[in-house]
């Protein structure tokens, strides 16, 4: 829950690994808390996808468009 007293992990891991699709990370994050609009300062963070702010971690996360992977949805998924 976003109002818990745990550390906000203010800039934690955006994806489990640089090779991992960020969409998987947001699915994981749902167990930790909900999402809010990304702060305006991250409007250019996700290259081929949309930004979501993980409330419990206070950090941005990218949900990649189909066919893109990477922390910032910056790479074409060759297996797509």
């Amino acid at each position: 829950d976003g109002n818990s007293t745990r550390s906000p992990e203010t800039n934690g891991l955006l994806c489990g690994d640089p090779e991992e699709n960020c969409a998987a990370t947001t699915t994981q994050s749902k167990r930790k808390g909900h999402f809010s609009r990304c702060p305006k300062q991250y409007k250019h963070y996700c290259i081929k996808g949309r930004c979501r702010f993980v409330v419990a971690e206070q950090t941005p996360s990218c949900v990649c468009d189909e066919g893109y992977i990477g922390a910032r949805c910056e790479r074409v998924d060759l297996f797509y």
């Epitope: 976003g2 109002n3 550390s7 906000p8 992990e9 203010t10 800039n11 934690g12 891991l13 955006l14 640089p18 809010s36 609009r37 702060p39 305006k40 300062q41 963070y45 409330v55 206070q58 950090t59 941005p60 922390a71 910032r72 910056e74």
Partner: antibody
């Protein structure tokens, strides 16, 4: 425990350059965004720059854009700030802080003095 | 740029007092606001994030409230170690701090 240790500050003439370093320990450095925040003597806090976990995304305050460059070496658990074309108004204590949005851990700071 | 205006700039209070510091953003920032405490010669310490969430390890006498443009930090019963300068910080449109509120001993 989380530790951030800045170094590289000192006295530099206007127009000169300086490179600050921030050595991190006590956490998995490569998983975290890191920022530089400064504080002029007797003044308030001013965010300077941040860099994402992998070093692919950076942003700067307007006051330093084009003059300062943030970078990181995850293999060395170290953050850097290359400061060029320094001005008197850059005189401040420079802190590295864990976070891009919020700053949950801070170093002790390093003093940069720009004066002739 | 979003400007953050804190009030008052300083205040005098006694141990046990209830202290309230306000912070106003020049435009709406939802709940993207943090509060920090700084003592002379030391680095700031995060107290509150997301406007009202207490950072781990911070005493429960500290609380935050507000959303949009108006925010408040409250210390329910001031302790000797709470005399310090407090800063608000918005993190919606990059990161900007208020000018600080110095809490002094009356």
């Amino acid at each position: 425990q989380v530790q951030l240790l800045e170094s590289g500050g000192g006295l530099v003439q206007p127009g000169g350059s300086l490179r600050l370093s921030c050595a991190a320990s006590g956490f998995t450095f490569s998983r975290y965004w890191i920022s530089w925040v400064r504080q002029a003597p007797g003044k308030g806090l001013e965010w300077v720059s941040y860099i994402d976990s992998w070093g692919s995304y950076t942003n700067y305050a307007d006051s330093v854009k084009g003059r300062f460059t943030i970078s990181r070496d995850n293999s060395k658990n170290t953050l850097y700030l290359q400061m060029n074309s320094l001005r008197a108004e850059d005189t401040a204590v420079y802190y590295c802080a864990r976070g891009g949005s919020l700053f949950d851990y801070w170093g002790q700071g390093t003093l940069v003095t720009v004066s002739s | 740029d979003i400007q953050m205006t804190q009030s008052p700039s300083s205040l005098s209070a006694s141990v046990g007092d209830r202290v309230t510091i306000t912070c106003r953003a020049s435009q709406g920032i939802i709940s993207y606001l943090g509060w920090y405490q700084q003592k002379p010669g030391k680095a700031p310490k995060l107290l509150i994030y997301a406007a009202s969430s207490l950072q781990s390890g911070v005493p429960s006498r500290f609380s935050g409230s507000g959303s949009g443009t108006d925010f408040t930090l409250t210390i329910s019963s001031l302790q000797p170690e709470d005399f310090a300068t407090y800063y608000c910080q918005q993190y919606d449109d990059f990161d900007t701090f208020g000018q600080g509120t110095k809490v002094e001993i009356k």
